[in-house]
Amino acid sequence: SGTTNTVAAYNLTWKSTNFKTILEWEPKPVNQVYTVQISTKSGDWKSKCFYTTDTECDLTDEIVKDVKQTYLARVFSYPAGNVESTGSAGEPLYENSPEFTPYLETNLGQPTIQSFEQVGTKVNVTVEDERTLVRRNNTFLSLRDVFGKDLIYTLYYWKSSSSGKKTAKTNTNEFLIDVDKGENYCFSVQAVIPSRTVNRKSTDSPVECMGQEKGEFRE
């Protein structure tokens, strides 16, 4: 059922990385426009992306208000020339999204190795603490601020001259590892939230190797 030439949205999908959160859907509109609404389970519906011909809507501003809440969105379809028109049941056609809990489901963005410093046979590797769009008291929180000790990093490191990888883990943004003197090492890190059931791991960071820009060496 529905208004002539108006089709309901389908394939509603949440795309979220480090809490930057966009709802996507199909189809590309032909003679129709969309409006999105978002709500928590116990809250009121809030309309976003009014009468748009896009098939995506940035809902970041809403979900960062409380990233531990579970959100539901719905996409309304209207005829392009007559947005007051409704479906046969007396309301516009709409489709519900899956539920989405940002804290549990947002993808962890690719981390970046900020620096590494060698002192003798130890190397300190620091991972950049990326800023998110989550705000408290008018300041943006970092990934570590939001996740605390739920977030760990895994370091993969290996001698430049070989392929055998070693791993280390930290619940901070720093690693202190033992290395062989006189050897150059390469590093890559991955963000992990072990307590999660989905989206537990980020992609690996770009590889950084000793003897390049980011490193510092001290005897």
């Epitope: 409380d66 531990k68 809440q69 601020d145 939001v146 996740f147 605390g148 619940n171 901070t172």
Partner: antibody, heavy 120, light 111 residues
Framework: KQSVEESEGGLFKPTDTLTLTCTVS????????VSWVRQAPGNGLEWIGT???????YYASWANGRFTISNDNAPNTVSLQVNSLAAADTATYFC??????????????WGPGTLVTVSS | ELDLTQTASPVSAAVGGTVTINCQAS????????LSWYQQKPGQPPKLLIY???TLASGVPSRFSGSGFGTEFTLTISDVQCDDAATYYC???????????FGGGTKVVVE
């Protein structure tokens, strides 16, 4: 207005069990943690423990076992239970909100405190 | 045992002057920066001044500033006012899941 407030303390006898309640308003316990801190008369602040926004609890090593923090009873309350009270537990007890929601030590909203006196 | 050692009390400050309070941790605080500073006046609960070593809490005058990393931290009060007379505490989270600790406190007397 966001606030936290402790329930009434009072006079207790050694070996009694104390239960204090922290009532929060204006924010959600699913997003913020709550810590309990105490201060004996004329002394400094002493962290007892924290319940984080996921409901996990953390305790000072000296408090483990005798102190229990929970938020089972109502959606806007956090309880502190202290078993086998002793004179050394005499203090003003504060609850406070953890700014980040985990056990971060950044406590941005405090209750006025409630005095608990343990004496025979 | 985790330990936060603060500047010994009391610390005297003149109105308009600057006062510095140090806080030394027995091991690195969580992620080297999760250390907070509090002000407490008699009969009142503590008030958060600084969190994450250097971030000013909401509504706190910019005369208060924090610095430090790892195990050494400093609270600085510039242009000291009579109203700044209070006891100041540092508090830190640690990498160990269960631990948060307060320093012993530093009393500031304004002359």
């Amino acid at each position: 207005k966001q606030s936290v407030e402790e329930s009434e303390g009072g006079l207790f006898k050694p070996t009694d069990t104390l239960t204090l309640t922290c009532t929060v308003s204006g924010f959600s316990l699913s997003y913020y943690g709550v810590s309990w801190v105490r201060q004996a008369p004329g002394n400094g602040l002493e962290w007892i423990g924290t319940i984080d926004s996921s409901g996990r609890t953390y305790y000072a090593s000296w408090a483990n076992g005798r102190f229990t923090i929970s938020n089972d009873n109502a959606p806007n309350t956090v309880s502190l239970q202290v078993n086998s009270l002793a004179a050394a537990d005499t203090a003003t007890y504060f609850c406070a909100r953890d700014f980040y929601g985990w056990n971060s030590g950044a406590l941005d909203i405090w209750g006025p405190g409630t005095l608990v006196t343990v004496s025979s | 045992e985790l330990d936060l050692t603060q500047t010994a009390s009391p610390v005297s400050a003149a109105v308009g002057g600057t006062v510095t309070i140090n806080c030394q941790a027995s091991q690195s605080v969580y992620s080297n920066k999760y250390l907070s500073w509090y002000q407490q006046k008699p009969g009142q609960p503590p008030k958060l001044l600084i969190y994450k070593a250097s971030t000013l809490a909401s509504g706190v005058p910019s005369r208060f500033s924090g610095s430090g990393f790892g195990t050494e931290f400093t609270l600085t009060i510039s242009d000291v006012q009579c109203d700044d007379a209070a006891t100041y505490y540092c508090a830190a989270a640690y990498s160990d899941d269960s631990d948060t600790a307060f320093g012993g406190g530093t009393k500031v007397v304004v002359e």
